[in-house]
C-alpha cells in the first residue's frame, strides 16, 4: 500500500531573467527513492537517479541545474517557462508518487512564493 | 568499452526450455536496468521483460508472462532469461539491452537465436 | 498497453533526400519516446532519446521532435549509411512497447 506523500513549494512565482528552485519532498513512507523525474508538461528535463546520477535533457543544459538535493533549479526564467511541473518518485517497493509545481513567471518585480501545499 | 554478449539461443522443441545469458562488461552493471527485446524472422521489435539494477522489480510482456523468468547476479555481472514452455511463436533473435534511468536502451547485445519448432 | 503506430511502413529516398518519419502514440507519453536503426542482421542502434535529445555519436543529420502523442523523425540529407530500418519505442511504461518500423529504401 502506498502510504507516502509528496510536498511541493506549490505555486510559485519569479521574475523574468531570475531563477527558482522547485523542490519536492516524500514523507510518510519507508519506500527507497530510486529514482526522481522533473517534466515541464511534456517534457523530460531531468532524472535524478540513486546509482547513475543526474541526467539534464541536453535541451535544456544551459538553464536547468541539477539541485539542490532531488530538485532543480531553473535559471535565466523567460515567460515562456509558465506552466506545471512535475516531480515524479519512483520508489520501491511503493511505486510512483507524483508532486505538481505551478510556476508563473512575471515581468515585474511583484513575484513571491506561494505557500507549500501537499499531494496525497 | 561497454560489451552485452548473449548466449544460450539454439533449437528447442515446443514445450521445452532454455535459458538465456547476457554477459555485460564495460560499465557498473548493478546501477543500470535492463531488458530483453525479441525479433521474430522478418518482424518488428518486441520487447520481452525487464529487472531493475538491484534485481528487486521486475516486468513482463503479456505474451510471456507466467512462462519466462528475468533474473541477474550482479556479482557476474549477468542477464538471464529463463524460458519455459515454449511455443513456436517464440522464435526469435534475443537481445540484451542497458536501460540508463529506465527511459531508452543505449547498448544492445548482438542477439542470439532462439528457434522452437520439432 | 500503449500502442505506437509508425508511418510510412516504408520509404523510398535518394541521397540527399530529407525525409521525415512519424510515431504517433494511442495516449500521451510526455517525451518519453526514443529512436533506433536498425540494419539487416544487426542489433539496433540508438539514435535519439527522450523525443529530442541525440545519442552521442549519431551524425547531427538525425533530429526528433514532438511531445505527448506525436513524434517525428527527421534526417536532414539522407547518406547511403541510413538505409535501413527504424523503430519508435515508448518508455512512458510497462509493458514497453515498439512501432511497426519504417524501412528506408533507395530509390
Known amino acids: 500500500m502506498m502510504t507516502g506523500t509528496i510536498e511541493t513549494t506549490g505555486n510559485i512565482s519569479a521574475e523574468k531573467g531570475g531563477s527558482i528552485i522547485l523542490q519536492c519532498h516524500l514523507s510518510s513512507t519507508t519506500a527507497q527513492v530510486t529514482q526522481v523525474n522533473w517534466e515541464q508538461q511534456d517534457q523530460l528535463l531531468a532524472i535524478c537517479n540513486a546509482d547513475l546520477g543526474w541526467h539534464i535533457s541536453p535541451s535544456f543544459k544551459d538553464r536547468v541545474a541539477p539541485g539542490p538535493g532531488l530538485g532543480l533549479t531553473l535559471q535565466s526564467l523567460t515567460v515562456n517557462d509558465t506552466g506545471e511541473y512535475f516531480c515524479i518518485y519512483h520508489t520501491y517497493p511503493d511505486g510512483t508518487y507524483t508532486g505538481r509545481i505551478f510556476l508563473e513567471v512575471l515581468e515585474s518585480s511583484v513575484a513571491e512564493h506561494g505557500a507549500r501545499f501537499q499531494i496525497p | 568499452e561497454v560489451q552485452l554478449l548473449e548466449s544460450g539461443g539454439g533449437l528447442v522443441q515446443p514445450g521445452g526450455s532454455l535459458r538465456l545469458s547476457c554477459a555485460a562488461s564495460?560499465?557498473?552493471?548493478?546501477?543500470?536496468?535492463m531488458s530483453w527485446v525479441r525479433q521474430a524472422p522478418g518482424k518488428g521489435l518486441e520487447w520481452v521483460s525487464a529487472?531493475?539494477?538491484?534485481?528487486?522489480?521486475?516486468y513482463y510482456a503479456d505474451s510471456v508472462k507466467g512462462r519466462f523468468t528475468i533474473s541477474r547476479d550482479n556479482s557476474k555481472n549477468t542477464l538471464y532469461l529463463q524460458m519455459n514452455s515454449l511455443r513456436a511463436e517464440d522464435t526469435a533473435v534475443y537481445y540484451c539491452?542497458?536501460?540508463?534511468?529506465?527511459?531508452?536502451?543505449?547498448?544492445w547485445g548482438q542477439g542470439t537465436l532462439v528457434t522452437v519448432s520439432s | 498497453d500503449i500502442q505506437m503506430t509508425q508511418s510510412p511502413s516504408s520509404l523510398s529516398a535518394s541521397v540527399g533526400d530529407r525525409v521525415t518519419i512519424t510515431c504517433r502514440a494511442s495516449?500521451?507519453?510526455?517525451?518519453?519516446l526514443n529512436w533506433y536503426q536498425q540494419k539487416p542482421g544487426k542489433a539496433p542502434k540508438l539514435l535519439i532519446y527522450a523525443a529530442s535529445s541525440l545519442q552521442s555519436g549519431v551524425p547531427s543529420r538525425f533530429s526528433g521532435s514532438g511531445s505527448g502523442t506525436d513524434f517525428t523523425l527527421t534526417i536532414s540529407s539522407l547518406q547511403p549509411e541510413d538505409f535501413a530500418t527504424y523503430y519508435c519505442q515508448q518508455s512512458y511504461s510497462t509493458p514497453l512497447t515498439f512501432g511497426g518500423g519504417t524501412k528506408v529504401e533507395i530509390k
Open positions: 529487472i531493475s539494477g538491484s534485481g528487486g522489480s521486475t
Open positions: 564495460g560499465f557498473t552493471f548493478s546501477s543500470y536496468s
Open positions: 539491452a542497458r536501460e540508463p534511468y529506465d527511459v531508452w536502451m543505449d547498448y
Open positions: 495516449q500521451s507519453i510526455s517525451s518519453y
